[in-house]
């Protein structure tokens, strides 16, 4: 029969002959003949190959390095790569998550929009009027101005995004 | 370890019939085609047989085929050479090897046949 | 049928000097599918070289295949004393029969 040309699902072309391609999780050790097998063996500890394959080498799995702020977040398989995070308070500068940086704070006349994850960074907000925030942080949001009237008080002094407002008493009326 | 031993040779008077065995341990036998070579005494290797994993393909050299014929039972890892209507020539050393796309990886030490009457 | 034939049919050599073989194929040996084995007295083959040129596991560097097409050599850079022994190549790209070359045999001087 003619030599194939192209080769099946999971299958791939070697001098003229289709062969298995090896299953996740396993390298290739020889490629298959007319009479034997593809050879394939499993990757080794903290190694892995996540797809049908005809690699000679597993992959080494990411190194969490404490030292660049990071954890493991999922360790690793003989399928799957270690998947890292950052230590609290920190988070990564990529997708590949290979360094940390530190949460980023919002300045007093912003508040935290949405709080930083170990894979994103803090989103700051301007603090609209009627709102401020009066601190440097990663976590507070803007508040809402002081309700003078609720407390039977009156504003003594209006309020900025960075301050609130300052109420007094109501000045009485003399008979 | 991986490990293929012969077994069967001895001395047969000529026309007469003997069967080999080679079992395999350490590695899946299954998956592996598995060869015939043998070696008359002071000579260099000879190619016999060979049959693909699962036992479907078998080739021969021409000088036994007809006579010999190589068959495998995974479920004993054992090869099988059943070699009928002997001749003086087939006097040898027979080995099983492990076929791989790198050549004869792993041989059995050997089993020896003589042919005589 | 692909004819192997090797020379010389011995080499007389001593430790420590290099060995050259050669193996030559009356046609061409497709995808270099030629492999070269070792076998001393009372043992099995094993396994040296395969694809003409890739060591097999565990063998020495000193050990070394080359050549495609119908011309191929095995070189051992520097001979030791466990070296001296017969030589065979063999051809397993075309087949029935896998052929092997007549050998050459390695013996101290």
């Known amino acids: 029969p003619e030599p194939p040309t192209a080769c099946r699902e999971k299958q791939y072309l070697i001098n003229s002959q289709c062969c298995s391609l090896c299953q996740p999780g396993q390298k290739l050790v020889s490629d298959c003949t007319e009479f034997t097998e593809t050879e394939c063996l499993p990757c080794g500890e903290s190694e892995f190959l996540d797809t049908w394959n005809r690699e000679t080498h597993c992959h080494q799995h990411k190194y969490c390095d404490p030292n660049l702020g990071l954890r493991v977040q999922q360790k690793g398989t003989s399928e799957t790569d270690t998947i890292c995070t950052c230590e609290e308070g920190w988070h990564c500068t990529s997708e590949a998550c290979e360094s940390c940086v530190l949460h980023r704070s919002c300045s007093p006349g912003f508040g935290v929009k949405q709080i930083a994850t170990g894979v994103s960074d803090t989103i700051c907000e301007p603090c609209p009027v009627g709102f401020f925030s009066n601190v440097s942080s990663a976590f507070e949001k803007c508040h809402p101005w002081t309700s003078c009237e609720t407390k039977d008080l009156v504003v003594q002094q209006a309020g900025t995004n960075k301050t609130d407002v300052v109420c007094g008493p109501q000045d009485r009326l003399r008979a | 370890q991986v490990q293929l031993v012969e077994s069967g040779g001895g001395v047969v008077q000529p026309g007469r019939s003997l069967r080999l065995s080679c079992a395999a341990s350490?590695?899946?036998?299954?998956?592996?085609?598995m060869h015939w070579v043998r070696q008359a005494p002071g000579k260099g290797l000879e190619w016999v047989a060979v049959?693909?994993?699962?036992?479907?393909?078998?080739y021969y050299a021409d000088s036994v085929k007809g006579r010999f014929t190589i068959s495998r039972d995974n479920s004993k890892n054992t090869l099988y050479l059943q070699m009928n209507s002997l001749r003086a020539e087939d006097t040898a050393v027979y080995y099983c090897?492990?076929?791989?796309?790198?050549?004869?990886?792993?041989w059995g030490q050997g089993t020896m046949v003589t042919v005589s009457s | 049928e692909i004819v192997l034939t090797q020379s010389p049919g011995t080499l007389s050599l001593s430790p420590g000097e290099r060995a050259t073989l050669s193996c030559q194929a009356s046609?061409?040996?497709?995808?270099?599918?030629l492999a070269w084995y070792q076998q001393k007295p009372g043992q099995a083959p094993r396994l040296l070289i395969y694809?003409?040129?890739s060591r097999n596991n565990g063998i020495p560097d000193r050990f070394s295949g080359s050549g495609s097409g119908t011309d191929f050599t095995l070189t051992i850079s520097r001979l030791e004393p466990e070296d001296f022994a017969v030589y065979y190549c063999?051809?397993?790209?075309?087949?029935?029969?896998?052929?092997f070359g007549g050998g050459t045999k390695v013996e101290i001087k």
């Open positions: 090897a492990r076929d791989t796309s790198r050549g004869h990886d792993i």
């Open positions: 350490g590695f899946t036998f299954e998956k592996y085609g």
């Open positions: 049959i693909s994993y699962e036992g479907t393909s078998k």
């Open positions: 046609q061409s040996v497709s995808y270099n599918y």
């Open positions: 694809g003409a040129s």
């Open positions: 063999q051809q397993y790209s075309d087949y029935p029969p896998f052929t």
